[in-house]
Amino acid sequence: TVPPMVNVTRSEASEGNITVTCRASSFYPRNIILTWRQDGVSLSHDTQQWGDVLPDGNGTYQTWVATRICRGEEQRFTCYMEHSGNHSTHPVPSNGS
């Protein structure tokens, strides 16, 4: 088992909104849960976009999940990752970090 590296980034979307993306990379096996939580509960699936789980060329895999949120509400969101019985949560970085 190779645990994923998880990275959360933010990018400008439309005015007043940002897109937050949670990327998991360099993990094996390929089964993984990657999802956003809002206010501590599941964010509805229709507001999230997932990338395919793809090989990254080193015998491991990568994937991502993104959602659009209101600027200033970043603190309400966390990315949840579960892989091979281990899990972690990852906050949205503050602007400029």
Epitope: I33, D39, G40, V41, S42, E73, Q75, R76, E82, G85, H87
Partner: antibody, heavy 119, light 107 residues
Framework: DVQLQGSGPGLVKPSQSLSLTCSVT???????YYWNWIRQFPGNKLEWM?????????NYNPSLKNRISITRDTSKNQFFLKLSSVTTEDTATYYC???DGRGAWFAYWAQGTLVTVSA | DIQMTQSPASLSASVGETVTITCRAS??????LAWYQQKQGKSPQLLVY???TLADGVPSRFSGSGSGTQYSLKINSLQPEDFGNYYC?????????FGAGTKVEIK
Amino acid sequence: DVQLQGSGPGLVKPSQSLSLTCSVTGYSITNDYYWNWIRQFPGNKLEWMGFISFGGSNNYNPSLKNRISITRDTSKNQFFLKLSSVTTEDTATYYCARYDGRGAWFAYWAQGTLVTVSA
Amino acid sequence: DIQMTQSPASLSASVGETVTITCRASGNIHNYLAWYQQKQGKSPQLLVYDAITLADGVPSRFSGSGSGTQYSLKINSLQPEDFGNYYCQHFWSFPLTFGAGTKVEIK
């Protein structure tokens, strides 16, 4: 370390409003986290009532319809529960509790405040 | 709303025995589950979150498991201090709801 302490009257008359205070020490309620009220009925059933977030937004249990309001006084680092038009069915032990954005589980609880609704 | 059904409602076991409490959700909660212990006259105390993770300071004789709609809390080698009520709680969606509880008595 953060501590929560609930307080308020132990007896409320039917049709009146129930008002409770949760005083928080060791952490600013505007900094982060979700500040909740939970009650436990005689017989031990637990019911989540709602929260006020670090940013001041609310989320309430729909079962309480329009009877519930959770507010705060940031200068005193306190948050409040107001439940209107109470009946004897609202007799319970009321807890304030905190969870964080990683997940809505309650790691910090105040001691309970028993509120009896009776004429 | 997601309803949580706990079983058994009560159990009695001897010190050293292993006991298992189960919790069934009315829909898939994807491991968004917590367990609490409550002793008489006290506030509930967090034992497990995310279905499997022990909270800080919780003895390793406690363990959580499950997936989908079915979850369990196991207490290995039951100790006298483990008596009390146990509750599950989901946090998949609002409103957050709790199971009705399991009373664990020491024989």
